[in-house]
Interface confidence: low
């Protein structure tokens, strides 16, 4: 229904706390360089204005759209051009072009320092002094580094953060209570960020239809007892929610997500038997829980997929009459039978099925033509299964760090032109798939591995889009989202690449490396490894292992030495010489 004042409607629906949090996230995602204090001031002004509209919906400007109200606020910021350059040109446009312009200027890789966690005592002190400001800082810092973070889910992580601090700051040993718990939240939030970015990419590049297909597959896997009409309704609603969040309409997004959660909990009987535990929780926890609820038990009496989609004499007639509906039912039926497949794989199969019908239904004897379609799925299914087996075997053999290194070598060979920091970041993220997925039961590995890899590779594509340097990467990134991962997997050593010459300074280290945290040490070593591969793209695994083992031994020796500086300055050049010889 239409409301006289959109801002009053959203304030009433969401409540002050969530309203303020979402407005803060929105501003932080649009203007990523502004300080917390600047944004907090704007948020307070918007909230005060919303309250006047709640009191009187006919008050001045209360009838304006949220885009107009928020855009006017952002454009009134002093020194916009000095701080944001051409983003300031957006302010010369009218809505909806102005909002589109802001969206186009979101930076997936802003030049901001890493979000450092203060030490435990300091954190607890500032949390106790002002929990609201403390959580505001958290929302601001995460949102500006992740401009497409799913806003209602960020509120959920802030709530988790809050609960952890409340619990741990009352403990004697705050550090050992906080560190593992906050690390856990950070890891989950980072995964949530890349997954949501993938959804927004799907929406931006391929439109709502592509996202809805993703949603149908995912929901059908999770709710195999729901009928097609129910799945379609949920997919339509979920598409709307994600479209709003990806489009910067965070208040509408959070409000509609809450509505969807309410609908699901009121209709458990026709959706799934697994929802009750989620539905007993408060709003943010409920929506989060529903988004990752376990798969319902598959119906025992499902007929073979071939009956309706291969053997039925009316296949071409049904397809011609309503292509999207027929393909939608195929995707639904196939997905509900295969919770063990990735969504990407299911979409590839649906695409193959569609292409087969397009070709065969135009021929003289369609059934003879499309009769083998399910058999032709086999290679498409085997490829990711082999990928999972090969990579999980390697992960189990090498452990996470070693597995990351193996991936780093592989991807540096595939795309040596890509910057070393991007390669290292990608390899570290891709390598985490082992820890995340390879320990799962067999039937959960494939969906976990492939959908996670797809999300990470989407980030590689986004970063590469800014400065395209590799034909290989451009080729894989310009295809459809679901074909990206197989495309990257199939890449081999880039024969067009002219290797870098060996530069001693790239492999020269100083004693300051000894005091770095383990993660930073690993990044330094992985940076050297990528540079080695760029120097010798066809180096064998044995050669690289020899060099890296020598390097690790050198660091270990010099970091334990009484006079570290002397050790680094004398042994360093020897290491460089040995490296050159080993790779000759």
């Amino acid at each position: 229904e239409a409301h006289k004042s959109e801002i009053a409607h959203r304030y009433n629906d969401l409540g002050e706390q969530h309203f303020k949090g979402l407005v803060l996230i929105a501003f932080s995602q649009y203007l990523q360089k502004c300080s917390y204090d600047e944004h907090a001031k704007l948020v307070q002004e918007v909230t005060d204005f919303a309250k006047t509209c709640v009191a009187d919906e006919s008050a001045a400007n209360c009838d304006k759209s949220l885009h107009t109200l928020f855009g006017d606020k952002l454009c009134a910021i002093p020194n916009l051009r000095e701080n944001y350059g051409e983003l300031a040109d957006c302010c010369t446009k009218q809505e909806p072009e102005r909002n589109e312009c802001f969206l186009q200027h979101k930076d997936d890789n802003p030049s901001l320092p890493p979000f450092e966690r203060p030490e435990a005592e300091a954190m607890c002190t500032s949390f106790k002094e002002n929990p609201t400001t403390f959580m505001g800082h958290y929302l601001h810092e995460v949102a500006r580094r992740h401009p497409y973070f799913y806003a209602p889910e960020l509120l959920y992580y802030a709530e988790q953060y809050n609960e952890i601090l409340t619990q741990c700051c009352a403990e004697a040993d705050k550090e050992s209570c906080l560190t593992p718990k906050l690390d856990g939240v950070k890891e989950k939030a980072l995964v949530s960020s890349v997954r949501q970015r993938m959804k927004c990419s799907s929406m931006q590049k391929f439109g709502e239809r592509a996202f809805k297909a993703w949603a149908v597959a995912r929901l059908s896997q999770t709710f195999p007892n729901a009928d097609f009409a129910e799945i379609t309704k949920l997919a339509t609603d979920l598409t709307k929610v994600n479209k709003e969040c990806c489009h910067g309409d965070l208040l509408e997004c959070a409000d509609d997500r809450a509505e969807l959660a309410k609908y699901m909990c009121e209709n458990q009987a026709t959706i799934s038997s697994k929802l009750q535990t989620c539905c007993d929780k408060p709003l943010l926890k409920k929506a989060h829980c529903l988004s990752e609820v376990e798969h319902d038990t598959m119906p025992a009496d499902l007929p073979a997929i071939a009956a309706d989609f291969v053997e039925d004499q009316e296949v071409c007639k049904n397809y011609a009459e309503a292509k999207d509906v027929f393909l939608g039912t195929f995707l639904y039926e196939y997905s509900r039978r295969h919770p063990d497949y990735s969504v990407s794989l299911l979409l590839r199969l649906a695409k193959k099925y569609e292409a087969t019908l397009e070709k065969c239904c135009a021929e003289a004897n369609p059934p003879a033509c499309y009769g083998t379609v399910l058999a032709e799925f086999q290679p498409l299914v085997e490829e990711p299964k082999n990928l999972v087996k090969t990579n999980c075997d390697l992960y189990e053999k090498l452990g996470e760090y070693g597995f990351q290194n193996a991936i780093l070598v592989r991807y540096t060979q595939k795309a040596p032109q890509v910057s070393t920091p991007t390669l290292v970041e990608a390899a570290r993220n891709l390598g985490r798939v082992g820890t995340k997925c390879c320990t799962l039961p067999e039937d959960q590995r494939l969906p976990c591995v492939e959908d996670y890899l797809s999300a990470i590779l989407n980030r590689v594509c986004l970063l590469h889009e800014k400065t395209p340097v590799s034909e290989h990467v451009t080729k894989c990134c310009s295809g459809s989202l679901v074909e990206r991962r197989p495309c990257f997997s199939a890449l081999t050593v880039d024969e067009t690449y002219v290797p870098k010459e060996f530069k001693a300074e790239t492999f020269t280290f100083h004693s300051d490396i000894c005091t770095l945290p383990e993660k930073e040490k690993q990044i330094k070593k992985q940076t050297a490894l990528a540079e080695l591969v760029k120097h010798k793209p066809k180096a064998t695994a044995e050669q690289l292992k020899t060099v890296m083992d020598d390097f690790a031994q050198f660091l270990d020796t010099c970091c334990k030495a009484a006079d570290k500086d002397t050790c680094f300055s004398t042994e360093g050049p020897n290491l460089v010489t040995r490296c050159k010889d080993a790779l000759a």
Epitope: T372, L374, A375, E376, Q378, P379, V381, E382, E383, K385, N386
Partner: nanobody, 117 residues
Framework: QVQLVESGGGLVQPGGSLRLSCAAS????????MSWVRQAPAKGPERVSA????????IYADSVKGRFTISRDNAKNTLYLQMNSLKPEDTAVYYC??????????PGQGTQVTVSS
């Protein structure tokens, strides 16, 4: 287009031998595990044997263990099944499939094996 063409079947006496071949095209043969499946009249398909993509791992149905040998030549994109000590109950249409599937992976019609005296 996935193409798997089976050959080598025929009529043989009990205790005799046959060597089946399956020529593959339209996909990267060396990346996929392969299987031999048979279907006797009025019976469901039965997976006889399977082999890993590199040929290092093999499995056999109990009914053929010690008599049948699966192998592959990735350079020639060909899968083989050496069948010795054949019995009347081995009579069936034999076809090769990609992976562990028991449904045909392509338009090939299989190859008929008949064991009879």
């Amino acid at each position: 287009q996935v193409q798997l063409v089976e050959s080598g079947g025929g009529l043989v006496q009990p205790g005799g031998s046959l060597r089946l071949s399956c020529a593959a095209s339209g996909f990267t043969f060396g990346q996929f595990g392969m299987s031999w499946v048979r279907q006797a009249p009025a019976k469901g398909p039965e997976r006889v044997s399977a082999i890993s993509s590199d040929g290092s791992g093999t499995i056999y149905a109990d009914s053929v263990k010690g008599r049948f040998t699966i192998s592959r030549d990735n350079a020639k994109n060909t899968l083989y099944l050496q069948m010795n000590s054949l019995k009347p109950e081995d009579t069936a249409v034999y076809y090769c499939t990609i992976g562990s599937s028991t449904t045909p992976s392509g338009p090939g019609q299989g190859t008929q094996v008949t064991v009879s005296s």
